[in-house]
Amino acid sequence: TQNKALPENVKYGIVLDAGSSHTSLYIYKWPAEKENDTGVVHQVEECRVKGPGISKFVQKVNEIGIYLTDCMERAREVIPRSQHQETPVYLGATAGMRLLRMESEELADRVLDVVERSLSNYPFDFQGARIITGQEEGAYGWITINYLLGKFSQKTRWFSIVPYETNNQETFGALDLGGASTQVTFVPQNQTIESPDNALQFRLYGKDYNVYTHSFLCYGKDQALWQKLAKDIQVASNEILRDPCFHPGYKKVVNVSDLYKTPCTKRFEMTLPFQQFEIQGIGNYQQCHQSILELFNTSYCPYSQCAFNGIFLPPLQGDFGAFSAFYFVMKFLNLTSEKVSQEKVTEMMKKFCAQPWEEIKTSYAGVKEKYLSEYCFSGTYILSLLLQGYHFTADSWEHIHFIGKIQGSDAGWTLGYMLNLTNMIPAEQPLSTPLSHSTYV
């Protein structure tokens, strides 16, 4: 591919998503002469970096270079050598690094420093690593899915090709679930966004959008599980925690020091008379659901309505794309079909959680036990978050579309991030000539 007689007039961009549980590298490609057109950028590669999220390297920063090598070398292979020097590389770190920064700004800076040292040694145009805000994460996820769905285009292009096309220009809301945070972003219907922190104004392709967004730090699936364990161990009579969110017969020893390592469990921290405790699964969806609901404070709301923890949430409006862990978990549970009602999802979760651990291990022999053991919790958490947290109902459930990819590109914040940083989302409808940089978002 590197020796074409007539090179295509294309450009490439690389974004690394440094999430709390892992890092993924995405390579995007677009025709150089169509930079300002909507929907021309597409993903050509995803490379999942082997290992944990970058925040876990805080005591072993010397290993970061090796950690990133395979995927960066993959990028070197995929992108023609002649394009290397003009290919921008961006790294955005999300809630895992936000949490590390809350604990120690210096430790977070040390990790980012070494990440930048590592990435700048490649032949690309490295544009820096940074911790993106929760608001940015929500906004860029919203931009990504609507860009890929053709919602910013004046023509209803891709009608009948895009599976979620509703034959109108009404944007989709974005629901993103990570390991350490979750984001909800959508355009409310003629509703004032009562809290300024949750309001975004965009002008994209000649149209104004008033967007609501919020990122709930500590409410990603992994941190939510730590929160639940910290809450439940408070009332355990001994070092055994009988947990309804794990399959019957499942056992796991947890170090109390690991439990209290994250800022997300600080509110539940107490001196315990043991250093370790054992989770013993009892596999009961209803009890698991009840336990999860205790993580959402719904007793206080200073606005006309709230999601939870006193955070403003306007009435839900339109269709939503639910991606990242919303999709991965529901896909594993075989619950992503548009035809599966919320009641059916709940029924299937009840059955799944009640299945004995030995049976589950046999049925899913190829899946790592660490991940396999947590699907009951994660599935229940997704239902709790969407129904009680965000106030979806059995009726509005059908407006949630669990999306992995759209037109071959992963749904997530990375594409929107790159489109913005490369000035590829014009404020006005592009004419024949590109607009000056000052007019971009």
């Epitope: 010397n62 700048s120 544009q127």
Partner: antibody, heavy 121, light 107 residues
Amino acid sequence: QVQLVQSGAEVKKPGSSVKVSCKASGGTFSDKAISWVRQAPGQGLEWMGSILPIFGTANYAQKFQGRVTITADESTSTAYMELSSLRSEDTAVYYCAREAGYYRYRYFDLWGRGTLVTVSS
Amino acid sequence: EIVMTQSPATLSVSPGERATLSCRASQSVSSNLAWYQQKPGQAPRLLIYGASTRATGIPARFSGSGSGTEFTLTISSLQSEDFAVYYCQQHALWPLTFGGGTKVEIK
């Protein structure tokens, strides 16, 4: 109080190599990075590269890539800069400088006195 | 790489007067900019970092401002010891880069 003490002046022949040292006296590198900056006679400052001892791998300006090697010995709190294939244009004062901190704190809060390297046949 | 451009190359100022030095970056460096002073035969000395924060021991007559691509170093009332060459340096992205310098000389 930490000082950066550099090795003495050198006169080198074109085509040869030079290795300049920079020792943190009165302290250690204490997890700080060391950059090398050069200044040709009557010219401005030119960043050559940097090493963070706890990371080990150096970063270089593209202009010097392949010709410069920056290393650090944590046990002696000494950084080294080796420049090969010397030419007359490499005649300059070579400074080591400590980076103030990590990430966005890569400015230089402590400088060595400089080492004059003269390349002449 | 980010190109740093300083202007003017030379600034002639009388003692007691105000000196304003400019530094422009070829792309945004946010507020990640440092200023150094260098006197003949000496190593540079850090004056300002983060665009506007004075380094330890730097007199209050030195002030920095700006963000993004345009930066200014102001010396409010020049003292005899301030006549020197001043360099800006971006500390946002690799490779780290310096401006070409501004020589402040006695008028």
